[in-house]
Interface confidence: low
């Protein structure tokens, strides 16, 4: 088992909104849960966009999940990752 490296980034979207993206990379096996949470509860699927779980060329995998949120509400959102029985939570950078 190779645990993922998780990185959260933010980018400007429309006025008053930002897009937050959570990337998991260099993990094996390929099964992973990656989801955004608001106040600790997972967001619905239709408010998130997922990338495919793809091989990264080193025998491991990578994927991402993104959602759009209101600027100023960043602290309410976290990226949750679960892989091979381990889990972690990752905040939006300020």
């Amino acid at each position: 088992t190779v645990p993922p490296m998780v990185n959260v980034t933010r980018s400007e979207a429309s006025e008053g909104n930002i897009t937050v993206t959570c990337r998991a990379s260099s993990f094996y096996p390929r099964n992973i849960i990656l989801t955004w949470r608001q106040d600790g509860a997972s967001l619905s699927h239709d408010t998130q966009q997922w990338g495919d779980v793809l091989p990264d060329g080193n025998g491991t995998y990578q994927t991402w999940v993104a959602t759009r949120i209101c600027r100023g509400e960043e602290q309410r959102f976290t990226c949750y990752m679960e892989h091979s029985g381990n889990h972690s939570t990752h905040p939006v950078p300020s």
């Epitope: 600790g40 509860a41 997972s42």
Partner: antibody, heavy 122, light 112 residues
């Protein structure tokens, strides 16, 4: 599941402030949301606010925004709630509780501290 | 705020009986993610509350299978199939779908 150990009972005067602590062990503190709740004697529970230990981000019940301030000290895995401008209406037991989110399930108050009794009296 | 109303206020039971507790919310408590965060807690005298049921019908770890939760929308029920002495206390329902999260007033289960 871990432990949540709250500070001891407090007797305070009206108008004063009090800072309650909730020391945790046995789980990764920074991964967790911790809520504080109020229970007056013989009454139901009220949710005050939560704090996400990883960032110190908070969400408050509007009723308590002017009254409560939540903080964390990650070095000691301790959550704090400061309650200010106390009145007799603030006399209650205050609990800290840890949320439980594993996978895509979620339970709000899965693990509780033993509670701290705050008595406001002249 | 979402008002949670529990009935009855007091429920006298005999040990071994089935008990049924009701909880009604003032509005639909489906979260924007599609889940219904309706939970049940038991508080015994002098103790902290303990989680029994989460997301309407899921038993928390270590909770006996005599406890079952059901319901949807605004009407929810907790059933205890055979009441034991350790089940006596005050039961609270709770909604965590809409901020501020709110509790019901409680139902006291006591010996008849």
């Amino acid at each position: 599941q871990g432990q949540m150990q709250q500070s001891g009972a407090e007797l305070v005067k009206p108008g004063a402030s009090v800072k309650l602590s909730c020391k945790t062990s046995g789980f990764t503190f920074s991964d967790n949301y911790i809520s504080w709740l109020k229970q007056k004697p013989g009454q139901s529970l009220e949710w005050i606010a939560w704090i996400y230990a990883g960032t110190g981000g908070t969400s408050y019940n509007q009723k308590f925004t002017a009254k409560a301030q939540l903080t964390v000290d990650t070095s000691s895995s301790t959550a704090y709630m400061q309650f200010s401008s106390l009145t007799t209406e603030d006399s209650a037991i205050y609990y800290c509780a840890r949320h439980d989110y594993y996978g895509t399930s979620g339970a709000w108050f899965a693990y509780w501290g033993q509670g701290t009794l705050v008595t406001v009296s002249a | 705020d979402v008002l949670m109303t529990q009935t009855p206020l007091s429920l006298p039971v005999s040990l071994g009986d089935q008990a049924s507790l009701s909880c009604r919310s003032s509005q639909n408590i489906v979260h924007i993610n599609g889940n219904t965060y309706l939970e049940w807690y038991l508080q015994k005298p002098g103790q902290s509350p303990k989680l029994l049921i989460y997301k309407v019908s899921n038993r928390f770890s270590g909770v006996p299978d005599r406890f079952s939760g059901s319901g949807s929308g605004t009407d929810f029920t907790l059933k205890i199939s055979r009441v034991e002495a350790e089940d006596l206390g005050v039961y609270y329902c709770f909604q965590g779908s809409h901020v501020p999260w709110t509790f019901g007033g409680g139902t006291k289960v006591e010996i008849k």
